[in-house]
């Protein structure tokens, strides 16, 4: 059967006026997953995102991540889109004072 991913969105300060937002998916099976950043509902192209390999996490499940750099103050325009085993979900960027957003997808 399939194991849905845990999705975690974090933010970190980058260069002046920018932040890096990272979307991590972990503990999922099977390996095939779509994980991408969207701006105003449209996915960014491959060359505006940084991608991690889909790697085994030691529990028979997998993990991966995708990151992009955005302008501070535009966080609300960006969401992380996840699709796995026919299910999908969308995850917002946390506000500046809350650095983690966890969602165990069902």
């Amino acid at each position: 059967g399939s194991v849905p991913p845990m999705v975690n969105v974090t933010r970190s300060e980058a260069s002046e006026g920018n932040i890096t937002v990272t979307c991590r998916a972990s503990s999922f099976y099977p390996r095939n997953i779509t994980l991408t950043w969207r701006q105003d509902g449209v996915s960014l192209s491959h060359d505006t995102q940084q991608w991690g390999d889909v790697l085994p996490d030691g529990n028979g499940t997998y993990q991966t991540w995708v990151a992009t750099r955005i302008c501070q103050g535009e966080e609300q325009r960006f969401t992380c889109y996840m699709e796995h085993s026919g299910n999908h979900s969308t995850h917002p960027v946390p506000s500046g004072n809350s650095h983690h957003h966890h969602h165990h997808h069902h």
Epitope: T36, V42, S43, S45, H46, D47, Q49, W51
Partner: antibody, heavy 121, light 107 residues
């Protein structure tokens, strides 16, 4: 004028190694993603590898991961593809391509003339 | 992986005709689709990026449309110099994938 000039191709035996180079000029090399794409004898185009502008990130097709390494020297304006454990199915024309950057997002806007790689015993 | 299904594999048309080539993506790639022209014995050249934007120096008889999963390249008033093979490429996510190509010939 953007120019990409590949070199280093040739005939190699299965299991052998080869290093391709791509000399770039006419643009600020360090600002752009760079790519290797190959064209098989059947004329099919296949993406091989990508390296990001800051050298930080590299990406590979499943068919070459673990055997090929993409790298760049921003001081010398040169892109490389180190190929090892070569197989007959790696026989192709190898093209160096420049990423479109912010003006042609997601596309490969300039290509070199290619260098031919033949893997045969 | 995203598969790109390109059709037809070849077509023959008369000079002055309008022809359309199609690429279908196996999943939503939004607008991250580019088209390339490869003339016999030559290298691929970018025609269209972002599904509909003409690359610098490309004649206006070339046009691209589509978003999501369905995309078209149209050549209006086919010219002798348009004899080539045309490829689409999805630039949404890795691995980047090309269509299998459409060979355009003159009747």
């Amino acid at each position: 004028e953007v120019q990409l000039v590949e070199s280093g191709g040739g005939l190699v035996k299965p299991g052998g190694s080869l290093k391709l180079s791509c000399a770039a000029s006419g643009f600020t090399f360090s600002d752009y993603y760079m790519y290797w794409v190959r064209q098989t004898p059947e004329k099919r185009l296949e993406w091989v590898a990508t390296i990001s502008d800051g050298i930080t990130y590299t990406y590979y097709s499943d068919s070459v991961r673990g055997r090929f390494t993409i790298s760049r020297d921003n001081a010398e304006n040169t892109l490389y593809l180190q190929m090892s454990s070569l197989k007959s199915e790696d026989t192709a024309m190898y093209y160096c391509s420049k990423g479109g950057g912010s003006t042609a997002r997601g596309a490969l806007d300039f290509w070199g003339q290619g260098t031919s790689v033949t893997v045969s015993s | 992986d995203i598969q790109m299904n390109q059709s037809p594999s070849s077509l023959s048309a008369s000079l002055g005709d309008t022809i359309t080539i199609t690429c279908h993506a196996s999943q939503n790639i939004h607008v991250w689709l580019s088209w390339y022209q490869q003339k016999p014995g030559n290298i691929p050249k970018l025609l269209i990026y972002g599904a509909s934007h003409l690359h610098t120096g490309v004649p206006s008889r070339f046009s691209g449309r589509g978003s999501g999963t369905g995309f078209t390249l149209t050549i209006s008033s086919l010219q002798p110099e348009d004899i080539a093979t045309y490829y689409c490429l999805q630039g949404q996510s890795y691995p980047l994938t090309f269509g299998s190509g459409t060979k355009v010939e003159i009747k």
